[in-house]
């Protein structure tokens, strides 16, 4: 069954945590649907963003942070492992110095920490996708 | 009650027709939600687009056409009559030489015809909005 989109869930992250998302683009790549995943510092959507991950399907991925309400320097990748019309599984793992983003089991993007992952309080998944799975796995200490 | 998004409806347009849309952005303007309205030449979403109207709420509006699968010259406007968090009523009227876009009763954008409005077979409304009304009014002959 489908999860509501935008999908918002409280989350606590640290090294070893993984966020897993399964979904499907709502439109063909010609129409440039988007997927966005935002790691927020508060439960409010207007809060700062520790890690912003936005896919323009078929075109590019941009990653960034929003600090004190302002977007910082964008990191762009043309790597496009997503398939037109196909379901995807996205996993974002918290490594000691960066986020590692896997798409369908393949390491596809990295983003070095600008803000501590421990500052994350909420994850939001939204834009032009249907969502079937959202999970945060925590490192067993 | 809410209409499904993306929302797709068969439509025939000509001078005098008006497409009316009521909805609300799904996120605060800081997060840059989008609204897109596309007038397609076929019932297929990958078909050409006679009039493409995309709002990046709080930032800008772009208008364009897609002909033989390729985007043409984009028209951009910084005019932003939409209000953060507020419902909007959008009406797109087919005038003899152009589309006239009204937002909450106020004339806000125009787009000169590149392709005959009679070529339109389908209208799609999508991206980051909830949709409460969609109507196509036809000129009484």
């Amino acid at each position: 069954s489908l999860l509501p989109v935008p999908y918002t869930e409280a989350a606590s992250l640290s090294t070893g945590s993984t966020v897993t998302i399964k979904g499907r683009p709502l439109a063909c790549f010609l129409n440039e649907p988007y997927l966005q995943v935002d790691f927020h510092t508060e439960m409010k959507e207007e809060s700062d963003i520790v890690f912003h991950f936005q896919v323009c399907f078929g075109r590019r991925v941009v990653m960034n942070s929003r600090e004190y309400g302002a977007w910082k320097q964008q990191v762009e990748s043309k790597n496009m492992p997503f398939q037109d019309g196909q379901e995807f599984e996205l996993s974002i793992s918290v490594l000691p110095d960066k986020y590692q983003v896997m798409v369908n089991g393949q390491s596809s993007y990295t983003f070095d920490h600008r803000i501590k992952p421990e500052a994350v309080k909420m994850v939001q998944v939204w834009r032009d996708i249907s969502l079937t799975k959202f999970n945060v796995s925590y490192l067993k200490r | 009650s809410l209409l499904p998004v993306p929302y797709t409806e068969a439509a025939s347009l000509s001078t005098g027709s008006t497409v009316t849309i009521k909805g609300r952005p799904l996120a605060c303007f800081l997060n840059e939600p989008y609204l897109q309205v596309d007038f397609h030449t076929e019932m297929k979403e990958e078909s050409d687009i006679v009039f493409h109207f995309q709002v990046c709420f709080g930032r800008r509006v772009v208008m364009n056409s897609r002909e033989y699968g390729a985007w043409k010259q984009q028209v951009e406007s910084k005019n932003m009559p939409f209000q953060d968090g507020q419902e909007f009523e959008l009406s797109i009227s087919v005038l003899p030489d152009k589309y006239q876009v009204m937002v909450n009763g106020q004339s806000s954008y125009t787009f000169d015809h590149r392709i005959k409005p009679e070529a339109v077979k389908m209208v799609q409304v999508w991206r980051d909005i909830s949709l409460t009304k969609f109507n196509v009014s036809y000129l009484k002959r």
């Epitope: 510092t41 700062d48 520790v50 942070s65 600090e67 004190y68 910082k72 320097q73 110095d97 960066k98 070095d112 920490h113 600008r114 803000i115 501590k116 421990e118 500052a119 | -």
Partner: antibody, heavy 121, light 107 residues
């Protein structure tokens, strides 16, 4: 072994210009953020301008905005600082520093020995 | 990122524990690094990511952060630890800031 060697410092009159260079070796230069940090005589450390990896945009401490320009040439493994309209208060040792990662958030793990810039008439 | 405040000087007897504080940061969100600088030399990183030590830095150096205060602790201070210590925090380039520096004396 990581090495950062600054050059281009010297004595310059107020209103003059200098271009500092930092030659980097021993690491993949293009993968790391870099920064210029200065230290006026007897004073503390002050960020001048950091630049993230592969970046064509940068930021500057308020006191040098519009006068200084940081740039990097990843092909030449070199960091630059173009300093225009120099003022006496720009007199300092200028250090080139390498970040631990592609952004400066995680700190600067290697520093050059510094080059002295003196602005005086 | 607002200014970071450090005491201008800290004294400690040989072999005792020295604590240098850094206040005013948003340390719940931003990492802290600490640097040691000896006269006429370039700074050397002694702590990064709040509490991690670069290779070659003795175990007596440690760090901790909570709220708006970060602390550098030198357990069993040695004569060679004398110098000026700077904290640094922030994230993206326009948020980076140094503390004013603390001169450590070991007597």
């Amino acid at each position: 072994e990581v090495q950062l060697v600054e050059s281009g410092g010297g004595l310059v009159q107020p209103g003059g210009s200098l271009r500092l260079s930092c030659a980097a070796s021993g690491f993949t230069f293009s993968s790391y953020a870099m920064s210029w940090v200065r230290q006026a005589p007897g004073k503390g450390l002050e960020w001048v301008s950091p630049i993230n990896s592969g970046s064509d945009s940068a930021s500057y401490v308020d006191s040098v905005k519009g006068r200084f320009t940081i740039s990097r040439d990843n092909a030449k493994n070199t960091l630059y600082l173009q300093m225009n309209s120099l003022k006496p208060e720009d007199t300092a040792v200028y250090y080139c520093a390498k970040a631990r990662t592609s952004v400066v958030a995680g700190g600067m793990d290697y520093w050059g020995k510094g080059t002295l810039v003196t602005v005086s008439s | 990122q607002s200014a970071l405040t450090q005491p201008s000087a800290v004294s400690v007897s040989l072999g005792q524990t020295a604590r240098i504080t850094c206040q005013g940061g948003k340390f719940g969100s931003y990492y802290v690094s600490w640097y040691q600088q000896k006269p006429g030399q370039a700074p050397v990183m002694v702590i990064y990511k709040d509490n991690e030590r670069p290779s070659g830095i003795p175990e007596r150096f440690s760090g901790s952060s909570s709220g708006s205060t970060s602390t550098l602790t030198i357990s069993g201070a040695q004569a060679e630890d004398e110098g000026t210590y700077y904290c640094q925090s922030g994230s993206s380039s326009d948020n980076i800031v140094f503390g004013g520096g603390t001169e450590l004396t070991v007597f």
